[in-house]
Amino acid sequence: TPEVWVQVRMEATELSSFTIRCGFLGSGSISLVTVSWGGPNGAGGTTLAVLHPERGIRQWAPARQARWETQSSISLILEGSGASSPCANTTFCCKFASFPEGSWEACGSLPPSSDPGLSA
């Protein structure tokens, strides 16, 4: 069964800046990755970025830089300033659409006890 992993890290240099990393463990052709916060995209979450392997990347504030790390993993850096910036207990979700298996998603947040710079 395919799985999705999510890591959330707070940047040591900017305490309200986050890096989200997500990966897909499974076969099939990844068609789309959707990153959201505040819950899954289909359950009240707000889309931060959509990454397509051929047609490019779309991102919305406070997302600063979304990119493919490998063919099956992505990373997203969020801006640390402004009213829409995330807080320490924000939930981030990644949904991988793989053809023809379907969609698989997982969510993660910064562990309450983690220091800046540590991976979730």
Partner: antibody, heavy 120, light 107 residues
Framework: EVQLVESGGGLVKPGGSLRLSCAAS????????MSWVRQAPGKGLELVSA????????YYPDTVKGRFTISRDNAKNSLYLQMNSLRAEDTAVYYC?????????????WGQGTLVTVSS | EIVMTQSPPTLSLSPGERVTLSCKAS??????VAWYQQKPGQAPRLLIY???NRFTGIPARFSGSGSGTDFTLTISSLQPEDFAVYFC?????????FGQGTKLEIK
């Protein structure tokens, strides 16, 4: 304008074979996953086969597995369905459809359909 | 596989009426739900994707809603051309499955 045009349907005896074709135009065929969906007379819709944009991943339900083979030729903008060991219950209109990644794999374009009748 | 159950199978209505069609999934399908319209002798036509997004050229009287397992398609004021069969579909997990359809007929 996106166009999908099916051909190859007809009357065939039980146990016989048919090869359906779908000619695509008006879009970059190699960038889209494709499927065959059938509809028996007066019935609902059933996915009978799907293929990823590069042709590397395919799907078949148990009802046709081992009898039907989906393939594509991206250089010719064509989708195919080889149907062997046909049964009376395979009688249906067969539609070629395109999946849109950005729409959660919804099928945003359909051909007009080609009728396959399996009868002795 | 995920089973999509539509209700009711048939609805008899008059032009101008508001109608709500129901679709229930046997397990959560996130927001990967689409709705299609099919008229006799024609191929299905995409109306709604991702639960609530209207496809290009679809009139505003069509709207979709729901989450998890319960979804609805609403037509705010039926027009003569809206009498057709409507199918919901989940594209969350393979195999993509369709509901059995709801037929809207003129009363």
């Amino acid at each position: 304008e996106v166009q999908l045009v099916e051909s190859g349907g007809g009357l065939v005896k039980p146990g016989g074979s048919l090869r359906l074709s779908c000619a695509a135009s008006g879009f970059t065929f190699s960038s889209y996953h494709m499927s065959w969906v059938r509809q028996a007379p007066g019935k609902g819709l059933e996915l009978v086969s799907a293929i990823s944009r590069d042709g590397d991943s395919t799907y078949y339900p148990d009802t046709v597995k081992g009898r039907f083979t989906i393939s594509r030729d991206n250089a010719k903008n064509s989708l195919y369905l080889q149907m062997n060991s046909l049964r009376a219950e395979d009688t249906a209109v067969y539609y070629c459809s395109r999946h849109e990644d950005y729409f959660g794999f919804a099928m945003d374009s359909w051909g007009q359909g080609t009728l396959v009748t399996v009868s002795s | 596989e995920i089973v999509m159950t539509q209700s009711p199978p048939t609805l008899s209505l008059s032009p101008g009426e508001r109608v709500t069609l129901s679709c229930k999934a046997s397990q959560s399908v996130s927001n990967d739900v689409a709705w299609y319209q099919q008229k006799p002798g024609q191929a299905p036509r995409l109306l709604i994707y991702y639960v609530s997004n209207r496809f290009t050229g679809i009139p505003a009287r069509f709207s979709g809603s729901g989450s998890g397992t319960d979804f609805t398609l609403t037509i705010s004021s039926l027009q003569p051309e809206d009498f057709a069969v409507y199918f919901c579909q989940q594209a969350y997990r393979s195999p993509w499955t369709f509901g059995q359809g709801t037929k809207l007929e003129i009363k």
